[in-house]
């Protein structure tokens, strides 16, 4: 990000780890939905977790806002909340379901599963 | 979002506000920007905030892999973080700045103003 | 190479309730879809519902309010239950295997050899 | 549910000669969603063909199948005395799954 450069390097002081990938296992089951899913019945979606603290790291991909949030928040936590780790990147995953007319449907759903991390 | 019309209608107890856009003023001399920004010296960012409940209303335009997460976070927070606030749709601004080699430059910056907000 | 052995009483009285097992062997049962099928003597094939190894089910509708399909992965078995049976649910009861990827699905391979079970008082 | 109907319900033929079994649907099956397979006095059934032209594994080329929607097609190119059997269809494009009524190929 263009402003990215401007942000300083004042280091952090919270060793809870920064934004980046975790798993998450999805059970279809357990979220009820197989009664209309086939396959798969489970799969690894991952989810973003962490601090984004400043300054913002160039592989997190802030945005221009996000430099400027992350700045603030820096210089005034309380006036200014932080920015937040999210998928910046998602990949799809076909699924075979059975449809509302009971017909089995194999179909690509978009953003199911998080392929990398950012502050935003 | 496909995956949206098959969260349920568990109504929220959170009396929090929900994901909505709120005000962040931007003061480039308060972050000592000053000495390279000529103009705007200041402006309205916005920015994010608020809870990300199950269920995601559409107007929050949940990815799927965030439906998923979501529910998923509302029948065990504990093992699965709630999805985030975080903006959706973003403007540029122009702005006229001094570069290296003291020239004054007209440049439009991206990604600077909040439109949006959802959960993520 | 998988194989599959159906096992339960050759006989129960109408009104009862059929219950069958089927071992699954050289194979984990998880990751596939386990299916029950009968077929009465003489007649065709009737699907009557499967199981996935995390307890997902689905059955045939007019069978569904009698019927229960369950599964123990710790003894790689899976099991039916036909409640309230009558002559008519006389059959040759048989266990098979569907692959549950999206790219192979909604076929049985292999098939148990069947079972005979007679409903008779 | 989709219902299959096969004909002839019974085929009379020699060894050598080539068998054509039809099975019809009462809709249309999604992706060409069928199996067939055979069966012999006293066994179970055995999967010849899925996805309405794929062999399964270990069959012999000289079955084949055909077809789409709601037509399909199982030929048998030059009869074996072991291919004579009951030969069932069965879609997996709508649930519930359904099992043709059968076609009987029998030694003319």
């Known amino acids: 990000a263009p402003l990215a450069t401007r942000q300083g390097k004042r280091p952090s002081k919270n060793l809870k780890a920064r934004c980046s990938r975790k798993a998450l296992h999805v059970n279809f089951k357990d979220m009820g939905w197989d009664d209309w899913i086939i396959a798969p019945l489970e799969y690894e979606a991952f989810h973003c977790e962490g601090l984004c603290e400043f300054p913002l790291r160039s592989h997190l991909e802030p945005t221009n806002h996000a430099v400027i949030q992350t700045l603030m928040n820096s210089m005034d936590p309380e006036s200014t909340p932080p920015t937040c780790c999210v998928p910046t990147r998602l990949s799809p995953i076909s699924i075979l379901f059975i449809d509302s007319a009971n017909n089995v449907v194999y179909k690509q759903y978009e953003d199911m599963v998080v392929e990398s991390c950012g502050c935003r | 979002a496909p995956l949206a019309t098959r969260q349920g209608k568990r109504p929220s107890k959170n009396l929090k506000a929900r994901c909505s856009r709120k005000a962040l003023h931007v003061n480039f001399k308060d972050m000592g920007w000053d000495d390279w920004i000529i103009a705007p010296l200041e402006y309205e960012a916005f920015h994010c905030e608020g809870l990300c409940e199950f269920p995601l209303r559409s107007h929050l335009e949940p990815t799927n892999h965030a439906v998923i997460q979501t529910l998923m976070n509302s029948m065990d927070p504990e093992s699965t973080p709630p999805t985030c606030c975080v903006p959706t749709r973003l403007s540029p601004i122009s702005i006229l700045f001094i570069d290296s080699a003291n020239n004054v430059v007209y440049k439009q910056y991206e990604d600077m103003v909040v439109e949006s907000c959802g959960c993520r | 190479q998988v194989q599959l052995q159906e096992s339960g009483p050759g006989l129960v009285k109408p009104s009862e309730t059929l219950s069958l097992t089927c071992t699954v062997s050289?194979?984990?049962?998880?990751?596939?879809?386990w299916s029950w099928i009968r077929q009465p003597p003489g007649k065709g094939l009737e699907w009557i519902g499967y199981i996935y190894y995390s307890g997902s089910t689905r059955y045939n509708p007019p069978l569904k309010s009698r019927v229960t399909i369950s599964v123990d992965t710790s003894k790689n078995q899976f099991s039916l239950k036909l409640s309230s049976v009558t002559a008519a649910d006389t059959a040759v009861y048989y266990c098979?295997?569907?692959?549950?990827?999206?790219?192979?699905?909604?076929?049985?391979?292999?098939w148990g050899q069947g079972t005979l079970v007679t409903v008779s008082s | 549910e989709i219902v299959l109907t096969q004909s002839p319900g019974t085929l009379s033929l020699s060894p050598g000669e080539r068998a054509t079994l039809s099975c019809r649907a009462s809709q249309s099956v999604s992706s060409s969603y069928l199996a067939w397979y055979q069966q012999k006095p006293g066994q179970a059934p055995r999967l010849l063909i899925y996805g309405a032209s794929s062999r399964a594994t270990g069959i012999p080329d000289r079955f084949s199948g055909s077809g789409s929607g709601t037509d399909f097609t199982l030929t048998i190119s030059r009869l074996e005395p072991e291919d004579f059997a009951v030969y069932y269809c069965?879609?997996?494009?709508?649930?519930?799954?359904?099992f043709g009524g059968g076609t009987k190929v029998e030694i003319k």
């Open positions: 050289g194979d984990s049962i998880s990751s596939y879809y």
């Open positions: 098979a295997r569907i692959c549950s990827s999206t790219s192979c699905w909604g076929w049985f391979d292999p």
């Open positions: 069965q879609q997996y494009g709508s649930s519930p799954l359904t």
